[in-house]
C-alpha cells in the first residue's frame, strides 16, 4: 500500500493543501485514495511512513512575522484532527520573494478510515511547478 | 533491496552529482547497482522509495539570483529523463557563503533497467563533509 | 520494527537530543527501545530506514560563526561513535530568531544492540512545540 | 497559460548561419523535452531536433546532422537551434514544440507549438 501525490493549485481559502494523481503519482491499489483532492485515506490499520514536502516562495516584508509552518495532521474516525509533524522555516529577505523547501516525515499508527492531509500557513505561497510538492506514504 | 550512497566531490562540470560506495554506504545486493558513480541502477520492477539530502554553501553576492535547486530525476529505459522531486533553497547572505541541507524524498514505481540521479544548480557549492550530502532507496 | 519518538526539552548540557515515548509516538515491539531517553536501540541486526527531523530558531547575531548542525549518529556495541547524516543551517537574521527545520534521513545496516541518536550544536535552539522535532526508525 | 515565442529568423545567403531562439513560459521548462519542427512552402511537417529536459541528449534527423546544434537554457526558459551551412533546402518556417512528459524517445508526439519563425536561404 503505497500513494504519492502532487500538488495542485488551488482558488480556495482554506489552508488544507490540494493534491492530483497527475504527472508521476503513484496510487497502488485501492486500500489507499486520495479523498476530495485533500486527505490520503487508508482502508488498513497499520503503520504507515507518512511523508510530504513543500516547496515556498515568501518574502519577509510582504509576509506576517510568524513563519511559514507546513503541517502534516491527522484526523481519525470520531476523533478530532491531531498534529504529527511539522516544520518552520523564517520568510525569506530575497526579492520578490525567496524559496524555501521542507520536508515532513515520520512512522504513524494509522486507524482503518484515517485520513492525513497537510495544512501550511499561506498556500498562496506554496510553488506548484514539477516536483516541487508533494506527498505520500506507504505501509511498512 | 536497497542502496545508500555517499558524495563525491568531481572535477566534471555536468550539474550530476556523483556518489561513492565509500564510509558508511548500503549495497544490500546486486539488484541495485551504482553506475557511472551518478546513478542508482535497478533490476527489478517495483515501487520504492527514494531519497536524497544535499548540503550546499552560496552567498547571494557570489551566485546566480535562481536558488540553488536539487532535483531527483529519473531515466528509463528508452525515455527521456524525468524530474521526480525539486527542492530550492534561496541563497544564504551569510559570508563567505551560509550552509543549508535539502532533504528529497518519496515513493516512485520503477521499471527493471531504471535509473534515478540527483541534478543541482552548482555542484561546486555542494557540502562533501561526513554525512552532508547523500542519496539511497529501498524497494518496498 | 519501528519507532517514533518526540523531542524533550532538557536542563541538561549535552548536545546529544532527549526524546520521549509522548503524544502520538510509535513503538512497534521491544525489539526497538529508547534507551535513556536519548537513543533507539536495536535487537536484531539488518537494513533500517532512520530519520530525524530538528527544528531550531536562531539569530544570527546571538550564535556563534558557525552555522546550526543536527548530526544522526550510531553507536555500535564495542565500537566508537560514529557520524552517519549531518545537515546544517546558517542562522537566521530575523529577531528574536528565525526558525528553520532540518530533515535527515538514510538506509543504514544496524548490528544487533546498535543505538542511533541526534547531536546538535545548540541543543538550547531547538524547538519543542508539538510535531516540530522528532526521531524514527524502520526496520525494511 | 503555456507559450513558446520563436525568434531569430530571416534571409540568409546559402552556406550561411542563423540562431533560432524560443522563449518558453507558463509551465517548468526543466521538465520538459522540446524540439524544432519546420515546414518547407508547400510541403508537410519535418522534425528537426530534439533536446532532453536536461540538455544532456540530443537527437537529430539525418537531414540536418553535423550542421545544426540544438540547445537549451533552463536558467532563461529558452530553447536554441544553431543552424549553420545553411542550404536552399532548409528554408522553411520553423516552430518550437514542447513534448509531453514520459513519452518515448523516438515519439513525435508534441502538445504545444510556437507560432513560428520563417528561414529563407537564398542568394
Known amino acids: 500500500i503505497a500513494a504519492h501525490v502532487i500538488s495542485e493549485a488551488s482558488s480556495k481559502t482554506t489552508s488544507v493543501l490540494q493534491w492530483a494523481e497527475k504527472g508521476y503519482y503513484t496510487m497502488s491499489n485501492n486500500l489507499v485514495t486520495l479523498e476530495n483532492g485533500k486527505q490520503l485515506t487508508v482502508k488498513r490499520q497499520g503503520l504507515y511512513y507518512i511523508y510530504a514536502q513543500v516547496t515556498f516562495c515568501s518574502n519577509r516584508e510582504a509576509s506576517s512575522q510568524a513563519p511559514f509552518i507546513a503541517s502534516l495532521c491527522l484526523k481519525s474516525p470520531g476523533r478530532f484532527e491531531r498534529i504529527l509533524l511539522r516544520a518552520a522555516n523564517t520568510h525569506s529577505s530575497a526579492k520578490p520573494c525567496g524559496q524555501q523547501s521542507i520536508h515532513l516525515g515520520g512512522v504513524f499508527e494509522l486507524q482503518p478510515g484515517a485520513s492525513v492531509f497537510v495544512n501550511v500557513t499561506d498556500p498562496s505561497q506554496v510553488s506548484h511547478g514539477t516536483g516541487f510538492t508533494s506527498f505520500g506514504l506507504l505501509k511498512l | 533491496i536497497a542502496a545508500h550512497v555517499i558524495s563525491e566531490a568531481s572535477s566534471k562540470t555536468t550539474s550530476v552529482l556523483q556518489w561513492a560506495e565509500k564510509g558508511y554506504y548500503t549495497m544490500s545486493n546486486n539488484l541495485v547497482t551504482l553506475e557511472n558513480g551518478k546513478q542508482l541502477t535497478v533490476k527489478r520492477q517495483g515501487l520504492y522509495y527514494i531519497y536524497a539530502q544535499v548540503t550546499f554553501c552560496s552567498n547571494r553576492e557570489a551566485s546566480s539570483q535562481a536558488p540553488f535547486i536539487a532535483s531527483l530525476c529519473l531515466k528509463s529505459p528508452g525515455r527521456f529523463e524525468r524530474i521526480l522531486l525539486r527542492a530550492a533553497n534561496t541563497h544564504s547572505s551569510a559570508k563567505p557563503c551560509g550552509q543549508q541541507s535539502i532533504h528529497l524524498g518519496g515513493v516512485f514505481e520503477l521499471q527493471p533497467g531504471a535509473s534515478v540521479f540527483v541534478n543541482v544548480t552548482d555542484p561546486s557549492q555542494v557540502s562533501h563533509g561526513t554525512g552532508f550530502t547523500s542519496f539511497g532507496l529501498l524497494k518496498l | 520494527i519501528a519507532a517514533h519518538v518526540i523531542s524533550e526539552a532538557s536542563s541538561k548540557t549535552t548536545s546529544v537530543l532527549q526524546w520521549a515515548e509522548k503524544g502520538y509516538y510509535t513503538m512497534s515491539n521491544n525489539l526497538v527501545t529508547l534507551e535513556n531517553g536519548k537513543q533507539l536501540t536495536v535487537k536484531r541486526q539488518g537494513l533500517y530506514y532512520i530519520y530525524a527531523q530538528v527544528t531550531f530558531c536562531s539569530n544570527r547575531e546571538a550564535s556563534s560563526q558557525a552555522p546550526f548542525i543536527a548530526s544522526l549518529c550510531l553507536k555500535s556495541p564495542g565500537r566508537f561513535e560514529r557520524i552517519l547524516l549531518r545537515a546544517a543551517n546558517t542562522h537566521s537574521s530575523a529577531k528574536p530568531c528565525g526558525q528553520q527545520s532540518i530533515h535527515l534521513g538514510g538506509v543504514f545496516e544496524l548490528q544487533p544492540g546498535a543505538s542511533v541518536f541526534v547531536n546538535v550544536t545548540d541543543p538550547s535552539q531547538v524547538s519543542h512545540g508539538t510535531g516540530f522535532t522528532s526521531f524514527g526508525l524502520l526496520k525494511l | 497559460e503555456v507559450q513558446l515565442l520563436e525568434s531569430g529568423g530571416g534571409l540568409v545567403q546559402p552556406g550561411g548561419s542563423l540562431r533560432l531562439s524560443c522563449a518558453a513560459s507558463g509551465f517548468t521548462f526543466v521538465a520538459y523535452p522540446m524540439a524544432w519542427v519546420r515546414q518547407a512552402p508547400g510541403k508537410g511537417l519535418e522534425w528537426v531536433s530534439t533536446i532532453a529536459p536536461l540538455g544532456g541528449n540530443t537527437y537529430y534527423a539525418d537531414s540536418v546532422k553535423g550542421r545544426f546544434t540544438i540547445s537549451r537554457d533552463n536558467s532563461k526558459n529558452t530553447l536554441y537551434l544553431q543552424m549553420n551551412s545553411l542550404r536552399a533546402e532548409d528554408t522553411a518556417v520553423y516552430y518550437c514544440?514542447?513534448?509531453?512528459?514520459?513519452?518515448?524517445?523516438?515519439?513525435?508526439?508534441?502538445?504545444?507549438w510556437g507560432q513560428g519563425t520563417l528561414v529563407t536561404v537564398s542568394s
Open positions: 514544440a514542447k513534448r509531453p512528459e514520459g513519452l518515448q524517445i523516438d515519439s513525435q508526439n508534441f502538445d504545444y
